[in-house]
């Protein structure tokens, strides 16, 4: 119960953050104007990884596309993939786990399966988290670095009569999306890895005992043991010789193909 | 088609409060638009006091912060103006206008003239 | 506050000829955002409000005629009216729609010579 629990809430904690990256690598506001001592302008600037836009007082909002590849900055190229895989492994991710989840019977798939799954799922919303963690990070970095360049350009050159005043850019609203998602998917990956553990049944260490009866020979393991610490070991109860008698988890009738729960 | 059109005393005693009213026809002042005033005085160049949005976030010109006060009244379809402290130095016209594209201003009352004596 | 410093205050042109009113500001009207110049230009007539021109420095307002135009960037800026006609005849304002408070020019009186 508490596994199913673990890896439902696994999964949707990551589906909320993959969708939040996604948000966020649509979302315009990337980088916004520092209004800094002027908190109302008549003319607002923000930008987006795909496009920047300008807030006029008068409520008009023009976007522009860049609609250029090579002509942009490296590092805006560098968020961009960051972003694109984050989103491609986290889709991949959630369609693995939904497959994988307990809750959900696929035919006669075995537990070692789910579990398996659980844990790809996991690894793949893992490196999504990071993945997006990482780009909003270096856009950040950007922005930092740009801002006190640009701070540094304010102060200098402004002994003539016109002054020309750079718009400096400061974190948007995207970012901290992009965190808490990326925050979501990692911390969503770990609980399906957390799951997995559960989902696999360990091999027991019990030595079989042999019991020398006058008809066949058999071997009887103690059966109804299902350890919860190995991660996706193929550990069903098998029988080791072809004798009458047959272990707890081959005498469980299998749901058949239709039977979803 | 968007019109205007400036409402108030044409005279004002100094030191007394200056009320004036544009009232918005032809459009919905909760259009999202900005709404500013704007006066001139007799002979001279324009000067930006200030706007209101519908939802009644202000903005006012430094110069006479201390002294405006723009309100709306949107069941009207009107906004106000109120200058006190008044001396003859703000006898001037008065237009109500509209911003558009470019923060540029299509849409004018015809004006106002008020008088600032004793 | 942006200063809007107009030249000539006035100026007299022979109908059919070439007007060009000059107007510059203290600082860059200039939005690198979305590579535009926020100044506009009116014309007033007396006994009436301004009418709008062009906006962005370059773009004529719809029902301006196209003998009206406007040109320049950053602090510099120019109206040009390419034939004088009788009725050009009034007072041109050029206006800082880039940060508050808006700022207007001093103007230019346009007469016939």
């Known amino acids: 119960m508490a596994v199913t629990a673990c890896q439902g809430l696994g999964f949707v904690v990551s589906l909320i953050g993959i969708a939040g990256i996604i948000a966020a690598t649509c979302m315009d506001q990337w980088s916004t104007q520092d209004l800094y001592n002027n908190p109302v302008t008549a003319v607002f600037n923000y930008q987006g990884l795909w496009r920047s836009c300008v807030r006029e007082s008068s409520g008009f909002t023009e976007c522009r596309g860049y609609f250029t590849l090579l002509g942009l900055p490296a590092m805006l190229q560098a968020v961009r993939a960051l972003m694109i895989v984050g989103i491609v492994l986290g889709a991949i991710g959630l369609l693995v786990s939904i497959f994988a989840l307990k809750c959900i019977r696929i035919g006669s798939m075995e537990d070692s399966a789910k579990a398996n799954m659980t844990l790809t799922s996991g690894i793949m919303f893992i490196v999504s988290g990071l993945c997006a963690i990482a780009g909003v990070s270096v856009f950040a970095n950007m922005l930092v670095t740009n801002f006190w360049m640009s701070t540094a350009n304010m102060y200098t050159g402004m002994g003539g009569m016109v002054q020309t005043v750079q718009t400096r850019y400061t974190f948007g609203a995207a970012l901290f999306v992009g965190w808490v998602a990326g925050g979501l998917t990692l911390i969503g990956g770990v609980m399906m890895c957390i799951a997995c553990r559960g989902l696999a049944p360990e091999e027991t260490n019990y030595k079989a005992v042999s019991y020398h009866a006058s008809g066949h020979s058999v071997a009887y393991k103690p059966g109804g043991f299902k350890a919860s610490t190995g991660f996706g070991s193929n550990t069903k109860n098998k029988k080791i010789y072809d004798g009458g008698a047959r272990t707890e988890d081959e005498v469980q009738s299998y749901p058949s193909k239709h039977d979803y729960v | 088609q968007v019109q205007l059109q400036e409402s108030g005393p044409g005279l004002v005693k100094p030191s007394q409060t200056l009320s004036l009213t544009c009232t918005v026809s032809g459009g919905s002042i909760s259009s999202g638009y900005n709404w500013h005033w704007i006066r001139q005085p007799p002979g001279k160049g324009l000067e930006w006091i200030g706007y209101?949005?519908?939802?009644?976030?202000?903005n006012y010109n430094p110069a006479l912060r201390s002294r405006v006060t723009i309100s709306v009244d949107t069941s009207k379809n009107q906004f106000s103006l109120k200058l006190s402290s008044v001396t003859a130095a703000d006898t001037a016209i008065y237009y109500c206008a509209r911003i558009y594209n470019g923060n540029s201003f299509p849409y004018w009352g015809q004006g106002t003239t008020v008088t600032v004596s004793s | 506050d942006i200063v809007m410093t107009q030249s000539p205050d006035s100026l007299a042109v022979s109908l059919g000829e070439r007007a060009t009113i000059n107007c510059k500001s203290s600082?860059?009207?200039?939005?690198?955002?979305?590579?535009?110049?926020?100044l506009t230009w009116y014309q007033q007539k007396p006994g009436q409000p301004p009418k709008l021109l062009i906006y962005w420095a370059s773009t004529r307002e719809s029902g301006v005629p196209d003998r009206f135009s406007g040109s320049g960037s950053g602090t510099d800026f120019t109206l040009t009216i390419s034939s004088l006609q009788a009725e050009d005849v009034a007072v041109y304002y050029c206006q800082n729609a880039y940060s508050f408070p808006y700022t207007f020019g001093g103007g230019t009186k346009l007469e016939i010579k």
């Open positions: 209101i949005h519908y939802t009644g976030s202000t």
């Open positions: 600082q860059s009207l200039f939005n690198s955002g979305n590579q535009k110049n926020y």
